[in-house]
Each structure stands twice: as C-alpha cells, then as structure tokens.
Amino acid sequence: PKAHLTIMRQTPVPHLKNELAALHWENNLGMAFTKNRMNYTNKFLVIPESGDYFIYSQITFRGTTSECGDISRVRRPKKPDSITVVITKVADSYPEPAHLLTGTKSVCEISSNWFQPIYLGAMFSLEEGDRLMVNVSDISLVDYTKEDKTFFGAFLI
Amino acid sequence: PKAHLTIMRQTPVPHLKNELAALHWENNLGMAFTKNRMNYTNKFLVIPESGDYFIYSQITFRGTTSECGDISRVRRPKKPDSITVVITKVADSYPEPAHLLTGTKSVCEISSNWFQPIYLGAMFSLEEGDRLMVNVSDISLVDYTKEDKTFFGAFLI
Amino acid sequence: PKAHLTIMRQTPVPHLKNELAALHWENNLGMAFTKNRMNYTNKFLVIPESGDYFIYSQITFRGTTSECGDISRVRRPKKPDSITVVITKVADSYPEPAHLLTGTKSVCEISSNWFQPIYLGAMFSLEEGDRLMVNVSDISLVDYTKEDKTFFGAFLI
C-alpha cells in the first residue's frame, strides 16, 4: 500500500482560532496516486493493512510580514507568529487523535513577503483502518499553487 | 536500484538570471554510491526500471547578508531574496521537464553570514529511462564543502 | 531491522563549548520501538545486519532571542548563533566517528522566543555492528517535550 497526495485549492472552513485545520488532497490527478488498496477519503488516508509505514509531508507556507517584524517592536519583542504542521492518526481503537509528527516554526520576518516549507517524515506502526490526516495552523497561509511544493504520502516498508 | 550522491565543487556554468542551475554530483567516493543498475551520468540519475521510488535531497545554502536585511529598508521592505531547490524529471516520452519536488524559502537575514538547509523527499512513479536532476536558484550559494551537508538520493520502494 | 526513537528529557552532561553532545532516546514507550534485532543501547542504535538503511531524524530547537537580534548590532552584525544536528556513525573497523548527515542553520531572531525543526534523512550502506547516534550543538535548546517533535529512526531498505 502506498500513496502520494498533492495539494489542491482549499475550501475555507470556519474553525476555532487555535484549532488546527485539516487539509484536503488531490489523489488521482497529476503526480498524485493511491495504490494497493491505500484509500483516500474525506481528508484521510486510510491504511488497508497493518505494518510499518514511512509517512511524509511537506507544506509550503507563504504570507506577508508577521507583526514581530515591525521595527517599532524590536525593543520589546512579542511572542512571534508561527506555522505548524501536524500529521495526525485517528484510530477506531482509540478515541483521541494521536499526533505522529509535528513541525513547528516561529515566523518573524521583516520582509514584505515570506515563504518557506516545513518537511516531516518518519516511520510508524499502523493498524488496518487507521486514518491519517495533515493539519495546519493556518490554512490561508498554505501554498496550494503547485503539486511539487505541498504534498503528503505514505508507503508500507 | 538505489543511489546516494554527494556534493562536489561545482564548475561555474553561465546561466540566465532566473534560470535554475543543475548540480553535478559525486557518485563513487566517500559515502556516495550507485547500485543495482542505477546509473549517474552528466548530472542525471538514470532510472533503470519502472516503479515507485523514494527520492530525496538536502541542499545546504550559505551566504552573506541579503539586501532586505539592511536596516534602512525595514520601513519599506522589498521582495526578499530566496533560495530554491527543485528535483526535476526528464522523460523521453514527454519533452517538458517535470518538477517533482520544490523547496523554496525567502531569505532575509540581518546577520553577516547565514546558512541553512532545504530538505526534500517523496515517492514518485518513474519509468525506465527517466532522468532525475537537482536544480538550484544560485549555484554559488551551495555549500559543497561536506558530503553530509548536501546530497541527493533515490531508491526503489 | 527498523527503529523509531523519540526524545526524552536529557541529563545535562558537561561537554566542551564547540563539541557536539549526543542525545539519548526513548526506545520502548509511546510511539518508539526497535524491531527485528535493531538494538538501542547507551545513546546508540546498533545495526544488526549489513545493508542499505534509510536513516532520519528531526530535532526541534527552541530558545530566546539570539544575540545578533539585538537592534544595536544590526549595523555591525556579528557571526550569528547557529543550531546543528549531526547523525554520526561509529564503526569498530574505523576509529574516527563519521558524519553521515549534517543539518546546520544560522539563528538570528529578533523575536523573544523562537523555535524551529531541522530534518535530515538519507540512505547509507551500513555494516553489522555499526552504531548510530544523533549529536546536537546545544542540548539545552532541544525541545524534549513531545515525541512527535524530536525523533530518530532507521530502517533496512
């Protein structure tokens, strides 16, 4: 079982300020695919058989100047803005979603436009029926323009 | 088929300002190797059999202060400098090179010397004869001093 | 053979200023595991059989303002602080530890609190008995609070 999913334009979904938002993905077009019973449905990659999987994702973020880049604040800096990616596992056997991987970075840019990727990848023991999703701190900062910049995948080792 | 290639000192090649430059690689010395008919030739990794490959690269960049770090510009920030890595596929069946993976980051540093890596990795369906290369936005910013800082590899899953 | 190790609180160990410090890891609890004779002992992952392994690690660093972020220094910037991760191989057959992977980044933040990950991953030919460890430039900057932020793993390809 294996899959490589690529970003698509996101439909804005209202969510609480500090709550992470789940991304939805392209699974059939361009370089995206699912194979050998790996299934993508409703923002989740669904694991078809138990085993050890390598899971990876890159999210490219872009935005305009973060507040802490304001020169007037340099003498009394504030907690910086940040960008966060979490790969989350939801299991039928366990009610609470589990954070498998987290990439988080403070963003304090003095330039007018900034952009940067967060990359994650590691191996996990997964059970048949486990569901994986990618959550981000701010969906509006995700670069959805190119399939090679923002993606999510997994394969059985 | 598998390969791990490491950086070597690059021969400066003139290229257009906004055109990405292809890196050439060490394929035999130190930790570099190619195996099971994976072949390296003229900046390209050549895929010997069709299948799903995990492809990865890290490029470490280093430079001196970018313009936007100039204190006089803080009040009127300009478009920042950036660093970009692209892993590109060239296929006989398709004339246009395809960008498989892109890592791009704005660079706006106020320190005199900066350095940072961009890491990429993902799984792709490749055909026999496909050729892979790594392109960068500015070859002169690539840290070629150590094989553990800048590298490129692939293996059949 | 495969392993995914996760961070735990580190015991401070005195070490020389420019010497890298080895991290110790969780190998049994939470999402951490070792499998198929891969063994973790005394900060080292011990390779049980020769072959090509994919090795990866993410270290999340966090700290307070680095010196070069001080506004008074902007006109005469100093060499910035930096964060470094090295995955090191120790082999019985070779007395000198070998740096397999290095991720290094200058840190020059004007915000009061900064945090960011360094991710590494690549394939290496290893011999039975080779030992792998992860070293960092400053153990006190490593975020040990969550197993999904700082981890180390390897699997036979």
């Epitope: 334009r9 996101q10 392209e26 699974n27 059939n28 077009l29 995206a32 | 296929a91 398709y94 369906s125 | -």
Partner: antibody
Framework: QVQLVQSGAEVKKPGASVKVSCKAS????????MNWVRQAPGQNLEWIGL????????NYNQKFKGRATLTVDTSISTAYMELSRLRSDDTAVYYC????????????WGQGTLVTVSS | EIVLTQSPDFQSVTPKEKVTITCSAS?????MHWYQQKPDQSPKLLIK???KLASGVPSRFSGSGSGTDFTLTINSLEAEDAATYYC?????????FGGGTKVEIK
C-alpha cells in the same frame, strides 16, 4: 501532437454491455488521468468517471457506479469504458478526455463514439 | 452534487456584439472551466481555472468570477463563435457540467 482515438460506433440491445476504447498518443499515457464524458442527442455533457492510468485508481459518478467500469492497458496506451445493463436512455456519444491537474481543465478530447441502444 | 445553472439557455447575437454567459453553482466552487462545442465536434477547452485562456484561444474570450458565480465573456463576437458553451466545475465529484448556452449568429 496529442491524440485520443476512439473505437467506432456501436449498436446494442437493452440489457447488453458495450466496451469503448480510447488509444492515446503524443504524451505520457500514465502521467494524465483519463475521463469519460457522455452526451445524449441534443443534451448536455455528463461526467461518467475517471481513471488514473498509473495506479488504476478510479472515481465514478454515483449515477454510473456499478454499471460503468473504467480500465486501462498501459502497454498499449489505451483506456476502456464498459457500460453494462444498457437502457435506451444510454444512447449517447461517449468521449474519452484527458486531464493533468484539476486547474488545467480537460484539454484533450477523443472524437467521440456513438452508442445506440435499441431493441 | 454541485448543480451548475447556465444563463441564458440561448442567445442570438449580431457580429461584433458582446456576449455574457453566466454560470451559477449550487455551492462554492474552487475550479471552474469553460468549453466550446460546435455541432458534431468534441468539446474544446476555452477558459481554465476561472480566467486563464487555454492554448490557442483568441483574446476576445475571457472568464471571471469566484465562489458560486462565474461569467464567460466574448468581447466582440465573430461568426466562428457560433457554438454551445458549457461551464464545468472540478471542485467536487461528480465533476458536473452546466446545461449549456447556445450562441447563434443573427
């Protein structure tokens, strides 16, 4: 240049099945997703489903699920659409059409295959 | 499924006149395309991703819109533009088409 060449017109009886082929050339067959769209006489266009030639992954319009089967033979760069349990209202021109990414739209269309269902 | 309603169904226009066709979606759409189809021909991609001209399409064609309301404009109609025009959404499966707008030359 890109070409999608479809099989010829078919006349079928109600309850029978039809299999339409679409041979692709001029591009990497496994790199583009193949769609099937139909158009009844004087009617508008109706999307049947798609197949990713590389993975074999499919996505069907629920209206056709269970009756339409999309397959590919990558060795000859050919896609197939089989429609079973035909009814008279399945009489239509059936098009194959390839797309790379959803923001690209369907740039390449076959010439169409007329399937007539009549007793 | 997302229902696309085109308006008008039919338009008879003199050459050089401006033509405006609207496509209204029953829920928000991220990816909208427009196709032109002439009698006994396959559809042809005209406008992709709301406003981008497809390869080889004359600049008199343009597209705009967002959310649920989209527009195809032909700035100065030519005789060869007599055809039926369809909108199609690629936001959620099934990827539906509008009912079509037939443009006839007076």
């Amino acid at each position: 240049q890109v070409q999608l060449v479809q099989s010829g017109a078919e006349v079928k009886k109600p309850g029978a099945s039809v299999k339409v082929s679409c041979k692709a050339s001029g591009y990497s067959f496994t790199g583009y997703t193949m769609n099937w769209v139909r158009q009844a006489p004087g009617q508008n266009l109706e999307w049947i489903g798609l197949i990713n030639p590389y993975s074999g992954g499919t996505n069907y319009n629920q209206k056709f699920k269970g009756r339409a089967t999309l397959t590919v033979d990558t060795s000859i760069s050919t896609a197939y659409m089989e429609l079973s349990r035909l009814r008279s209202d399945d009489t239509a021109v059936y098009y194959c059409a390839s797309i790379y990414q959803r923001h690209d739209g369907i740039a390449y269309w076959g010439q169409g295959t007329l399937v007539t269902v009549s007793s | 499924e997302i229902v696309l309603t085109q308006s008008p169904d039919f338009q008879s226009v003199t050459p050089k006149e401006k033509v405006t066709i609207t496509c209204s979606a029953s829920s928000s759409v991220n990816y909208m395309h427009w196709y032109q189809q002439k009698p006994d021909q396959s559809p042809k991609l005209l406008i992709k991703d709301t406003s981008k001209l497809a390869s080889g399409v004359p600049s008199r064609f343009s597209g705009s819109g967002s959310g649920t309301d989209f527009t195809l404009t032909i700035n100065s109609l030519e005789a060869e533009d007599a055809a039926t025009y369809y909108c199609q959404q690629w936001s959620s499966s099934p990827y539906t088409f509008g009912g079509g707008t037939k443009v006839e030359i007076k």
